[in-house]
Every structure is written in C-alpha cells, then in structure tokens.
C-alpha cells in the first residue's frame, strides 16, 4: 500500500473507562496532511461520528469508555501529499478493580503507572491524562489504597499530587480521578498508580540534564521550517517531565491556535541507569516575532533555551 | 572535575587475583551522574574497557573479562575496587581507574595516573 | 559487540596542517561516539563527547563530526603538543563500551 511504518507503541489500559491516543509524529504531521484511524487492518476507517463510543477525533482516536474487545492493533495512516505513514497501536484492556489489595499481575506497565517518590524529599506524582480538547476535564482527586488523600503534607496542583517530607509509608498503591465531560456526558477515568520510595537523591541525587540546547543562539532565515531537540540525560528513577515552553506557556499552549509552532513526540534511549531524551520543537515558518524570543526547554529544574536570530546580511551579494 | 588515584601491587603472580583500590577526590563517589571504571592498556597497544559500577552498586562488565571480574564500591571511603582472579601473562597492562560521566551516553572525562601491573612468576 | 575502527592507524603530518582521523563502527551507535587523546607514559585526556561536543579547557582546533557508523575527528592547524595518538570510543545503551585500535599521529 506504500505507506511506510514508524513504529509500534504498546498501551495497556482499562476497561469501563475513557482512553485516548493522538496521531502525532512531528515533523511528519506539522505539514498539509490527513490522518485516518483503522483498526486490525480493516479497511474501514474508524467512524468520525462524535456519537460513537470509539470514534477519531482530529488526529486522535477516542473510546468512550473503553471495553474489553477493543483489545488489538489499531493503525493511524498520516498521508501527505507525497508520502504515507502508519502508526501502529497494540491496545491491551485489562479488567481492573483499583481497590485490590495490589497492582500486582499486570504486564509491563508502563513508566506512566509506576512512580517514584524521594525520601526525605518535596517531591510530587503525576495524574497523566491525554484526551483531544472536545474532552473537558474537572478537578483531580487523589486517593491511596482507596482513600482519599487529605492531609498537610499533599497539595493537589492541576494533574500534581505535591507530597512534602516523603516517608517511607507514602509507598503503595494510588489513584488519580477526573470527571471527563464530552458532548454532555460524563465518564470517570481512574488511574493506577504503583509508587515506591527511594533514598538515592539522599546521595548525589540527579537533576536532569539538558546536553542540548546549551543557551545560545540559532541564525535562521524568515520563512524556513526549523526543527529543534531537546537533548536530556536523566536518571531512570526521576519522574521529571520534559517539554518546550515560550513566555512561561507550553509551546502546545501558546499555539493552539496556528499550531504553528509544536513541541514533538518525546522518544528515548535507555543506557544503563539513565535515560537519553529527546524532545523537539518545530516551527512549521519561522515568522519575525519568533526572533529574540527565549524558547525554553524544561526538564525538571532544569531549563535551557534557543534564540532565533537573522543571519548576518551577507555583503558579498550586493 | 574529580581526581582519582589507583593503588595496589604492580607484580602478581600467575593464577592469583589481582586487587586494586581507586580513591576519588574533589568530589563524591555518590553522585547520580556518574559510573565508576576500570581500563587497562596491554603494552603498546589500545585501550580495554574493563567494568564500571553505579553508585547504587549496580556493575557493568566487559563480556570478555566478566567470569573473573568483580568490581565493588564503597560510598563511605570514596573508594571503589576491582578485583581480577586467575591471572595470565595477557593481563600484564597498565590498569588505570576513571569517573565516566553520564552524558549523552557516557564518556571518561576524569582519569588516574595508571598502575601497571605485571603478571609474572 | 560493536567494533570500531579507525584510519589510519599512524600518519606523519607537519605543524600548522589540516588533519583528519576518521572512525567506523560496526553498527549504528547514532551520535554516541567519544575522542580521547593520549600522550606517552600518561593516561587518555577526552576532547570531544557526543561526536561533536567540545570537552571544557579544549582548544577549538579539535572538532568532531559524524552520525550512524561514520565519524571523524579534525585538527583544523596541528600544534607541537598534538602529536599523540588518538582514541575513539563508543557508549551506545545495551552494548558493552570499545575503543577503535588507535591512530598514533607524528611529526614528519
């Protein structure tokens, strides 16, 4: 069919709940291109109709709730005007009641449900929640081992759980939750959350480091396509985010309008104890008021930034 | 950037175990953002990667060497070890010990002065 | 395990030239990819990590260049002090780290 294929992602999730997936793969979907949603092969798109409890929202795909026989392959296919590109999805529904006494017997969850706190440490857990915007998402609560969580030492923060002065009781098993709203209904989504303490950043600790950008600035013309990464060392251990901002604003944010300007697909290499990430910006033409601006890229603590600048006039022409 | 200095024989004996001690100074052992390593040099020639431990205790070994390799650490005297066995004359090199930085990937940007080591009866 | 390979492995050059020592490797190791510099009697010194990025304290007449399996490392004006031989190494994830064979670099 001629379509080139990226790479395969592996998701386990579940059941009785919302779940959503966005086709995305900078520089490729940046451009003029339509991405379309199959599953197992089939030859029939998955239905745009925002009725239907699995249907393709923009580029996401979005199950309204999701049910044990959605397990399987899902496929997106990014067409261009000159080029093709496939996606591939493995979603894995398992049946889970979060108020069991463990977490224990799920396969290779991913890094999303399994968090670290620092003892001795301020440190926070994240509620990782990605839904299209036509999903409207109300005020996180917070639970462990089925309790809600109150108390001095935790501060709920938009999708943060702030724990203050980790202690070793805070490991086990906890649960974020939010009403998503979506053409008038509501669906609860509730995610596990494994968490173990560590006393390593009592050592040396670790704050992630940015090897590139290193503060500096890049000569570029007006109107060019610029592709940008975020090169970041970090522990395995650390639960840092990565991502690009611009005037305190993730870049995402700041250009929701144009999309213009986006921040890519974050991969990674694993080495030994660490991971290497990459995180990219794009900017689809670089206009003048992108010239002088600091685009920051945030790993942690850590920032470091590019500044666009014009090349020097080039006297030799005139 | 940290300091390291070797210590231990320079002549062993075929058969036995060869033990070297890297102390480390100017900064801590415990830092997240560094592996802890043995290379050695055979005369004249390149360089061989040995091992490098984690300050966790975690280790890594050169597949070559590994049935006959431990290398340990010890956060409270800065320290770190190898630690040889069943010595042949083809171990005979100067072994030095280095801080390897994780990095983008890692490399060795502080070294000792080397020891050699002969293995000789 | 990934093997490297450097060329040449000696050359003869004159103060103020141009050189270049290049490194291969057996497979892809992306941009993982270190240069160390070695004198007589003393222990490596590293000029360039991430096959392009200048140690602190090095002089900018080192520069490195190459992804994939392809790097090189130039002298842009040899110095007396850079006569030495010359290492590459790679640090890429899972595989066990190797240095190229080496490239002793005199004065003609």
């Known amino acids: 069919d001629g379509c080139k294929d990226i790479f395969m992602k592996n998701e386990i999730l579940s059941a009785s709940q919302p779940f959503a997936f966005n086709c995305t793969f900078p520089p490729i979907t940046s451009g003029e291109v339509s991405v379309t949603w199959y599953k197992n092969s089939s030859k029939i798109p998955v239905s745009k109709i925002i009725q239907s409890r699995i249907h393709q929202d923009e580029t996401w795909i979005l199950f309204l709730p999701m049910e044990w026989g959605d397990s399987g392959v899902y496929q997106c296919v990014i067409k261009g005007r000159d080029s093709c590109h496939r996606i591939h999805v493995n979603l894995t529904v398992f049946e889970k009641h979060w108020c069991d006494t463990s977490i224990g017997g799920l396969p290779n969850l991913s890094d999303e449900y399994k968090q670290i706190l620092h003892l001795g440490k301020d440190d926070s857990l994240t509620c990782h929640l990605h839904f299209p915007k036509s999903c409207v998402l109300g005020p996180i609560k917070w639970y462990k081992d089925c309790n809600e969580i109150k108390g001095e030492r935790f501060t709920v923060l938009e999708t943060r759980l702030l724990v203050s002065n980790v202690s070793a009781e805070d490991r086990g098993n906890y649960a974020c939750q939010a009403i998503l709203t979506h053409s008038g209904k509501q669906y609860e989504v509730l995610n596990g959350i494994t968490v173990s303490i560590t006393e390593r950043a009592g050592y040396g600790g670790s704050v992630p480091k940015i090897i590139y950008p290193k503060n500096h600035s890049i000569e570029v013309q007006l109107g060019t396509t610029l592709i940008v990464d975020c090169n970041v060392t970090d522990t395995k251990d650390n639960t840092n985010l990565r991502c690009w901002r611009v005037n305190n604003t993730l870049v995402d944010d700041y250009y929701d309008e144009s999309k213009r300007i986006r921040e890519g697909v974050e991969t990674h290499v694993s080495f030994r104890e660490h991971n290497l990430y990459t995180v990219n910006i794009t900017f689809l033409e670089v206009k003048m008021e992108d010239y002088g601006l600091p685009f920051m890229c945030h790993a942690g603590v850590s920032t470091a930034y590019i500044i666009l600048q014009l090349p020097a006039p080039d006297f030799r022409a005139y | 950037q940290v300091q390291l200095q070797e210590s231990g024989p320079g002549l062993v004996k075929p058969s036995q175990t060869l033990s070297l001690t890297c102390t480390v100074s100017g900064g801590s052992i415990s830092s997240a953002d560094y592996y802890w390593s043995w290379i050695r040099q055979h005369p004249g020639k390149g360089l061989e990667w040995i091992g490098s431990?984690?300050?966790?205790?975690?280790?890594y070994y050169n597949p070559s060497l590994k049935s006959r390799l431990t290398i340990s650490i010890d956060t409270s005297e800065n320290q770190f070890s190898l630690k040889l066995t069943s010595l042949t004359a083809a171990d005979t090199a100067v072994y030095y010990c280095a801080s390897e930085e994780a990095n983008w990937g890692s490399h060795f940007d502080s070294w000792g002065q080397g020891t050699l080591v002969t293995v000789s009866s | 395990d990934i093997q490297m390979t450097q060329s040449p492995s000696s050359l003869s050059a004159s103060v103020g030239d141009r050189v270049t020592i290049t490194c291969r490797a057996s497979?892809?190791?992306?941009?993982?990819l270190n240069w160390y510099q070695q004198k007589p009697g003393k222990a490596p010194k590293l000029l360039i990590y991430a096959a392009s990025s200048l140690q602190s304290g090095v002089p900018s007449r080192f520069s490195g260049s190459g992804s994939g399996t392809d790097f090189t490392l130039t002298i842009s004006s040899l110095q007396p002090e850079d006569f030495a031989s010359y290492y590459c190494?790679?640090?890429?994830?899972?595989?066990?780290?190797?240095f190229g064979q080496g490239t002793r670099l005199e004065i003609k």
């Open positions: 497979q892809s190791i992306d941009n993982f």
């Open positions: 431990i984690y300050y966790t205790g975690s280790t």
């Open positions: 190494q790679h640090s890429h994830s899972a595989h066990p780290i190797t």
